[in-house]
Amino acid sequence: SETTTGTSSNSSQSTSNSGLAPNPTNATTKAAG
């Protein structure tokens, strides 16, 4: 999938964590189609 940034604000601002995507892990791999 694709995400375009540079428009509205980020929903993660209320947390203490960064809103950037975490490091990839094999658990995030998409299921085979």
Epitope: S1, E2, T3, T5, G6, S9, N10, S12, Q13, S16, S18, G19, L20, A21, P22, N23, P24, T25, N26, T28, T29, K30
Partner: antibody
Framework: QVQLVQSGAEVKKPGASVKVSCKAS????????MGWVRQAPGQGLEWMGE????????TFNQKFKSRVTMTRDTSISTAYMELSRLRSDDTAVYYC???????????WGQGTTVTVSS | DIQLTQSPSFLSASVGDRVTITCRAS??????LAWYQQKPGKAPKLLIY???TLHSGIPSRFRGSGSGTEFTLTISSLQPEDFATYYC?????????FGQGTKLEIK
């Protein structure tokens, strides 16, 4: 040690496309996003976007969304960035950079100079 | 987009001096600010991330501080190899953005 080695300098005509490669070594290529940053002559740094090497999910800077294509080949630990419909103001050094969630852009390629000139 | 404004844009100093560069964000980025050093013809090098954490191999004369919207990079005793351009960069939200840079020159 972590190394990112980019392809060589390119000279292109306006309207053409350029594809820059970035070969990673010294770490698990699939464990980190690969970002792309450019720097026009005498100017600052501009983030273009990044790719998740496992899922191929991409996040773009809106400025480049319509012209940039990011891909990867995990079998050779290489990321690619293609910029189309080149203009003279795309003349810049293009860097790949590994992004770690905790530390941000922690390792960078040596840069690829792209010159757009008629 | 989050705008980062560095000051000063140019700084002249001498070996042994203590210098401070400021980076202000247009809205809170919590602690998620990184600092980079770039020398002519070379790629940027990460110095500090998450506001104050020194990247591996970076000398302890480099110190980062701040949170929210105001951050500083301090070099406690300038060495000849420290004369370069320094950039701040927020890693709190997309799109990732950079400050315009501070060029540190020999006086």
């Amino acid at each position: 040690q972590v190394q990112l080695v980019q392809s060589g300098a390119e000279v292109k005509k306006p309207g053409a496309s350029v594809k820059v490669s970035c070969k990673a070594s010294g770490y698990d290529f699939t464990g980190y996003h690969m970002g792309w940053v450019r720097q026009a002559p005498g100017q600052g740094l501009e983030w273009m976007g990044e790719i998740n090497p496992i899922t191929s999910d991409k996040t773009f800077n809106q400025k480049f969304k319509s012209r940039v294509t990011m891909t990867r080949d995990t079998s050779i630990s290489t990321a690619y960035m293609e910029l189309s419909r080149l203009r003279s103001d795309d003349t810049a050094v293009y860097y790949c950079a590994r992004r770690d969630y905790g530390t941000s852009l922690d390792y960078w390629g040596q840069g690829t100079t792209v010159t757009v000139s008629s | 987009d989050i705008q980062l404004t560095q000051s000063p844009s140019f700084l002249s100093a001498s070996v042994g001096d203590r210098v401070t560069i400021t980076c202000r964000a247009s809205k809170s980025i919590k602690k998620y600010l990184a600092w980079y050093q770039q020398k002519p013809g070379k790629a940027p090098k990460l110095l500090i991330y998450a506001g104050s954490t020194l990247h591996s191999g970076i000398p302890s004369r480099f110190r980062g501080s701040g949170s929210g919207t105001e951050f500083t990079l301090t070099i406690s005793s300038l060495q000849p190899e420290d004369f370069a351009t320094y950039y701040c960069q927020q890693h709190n939200e997309y799109p990732i953005t950079f400050g315009q840079g501070t060029k540190l020159e020999i006086k």
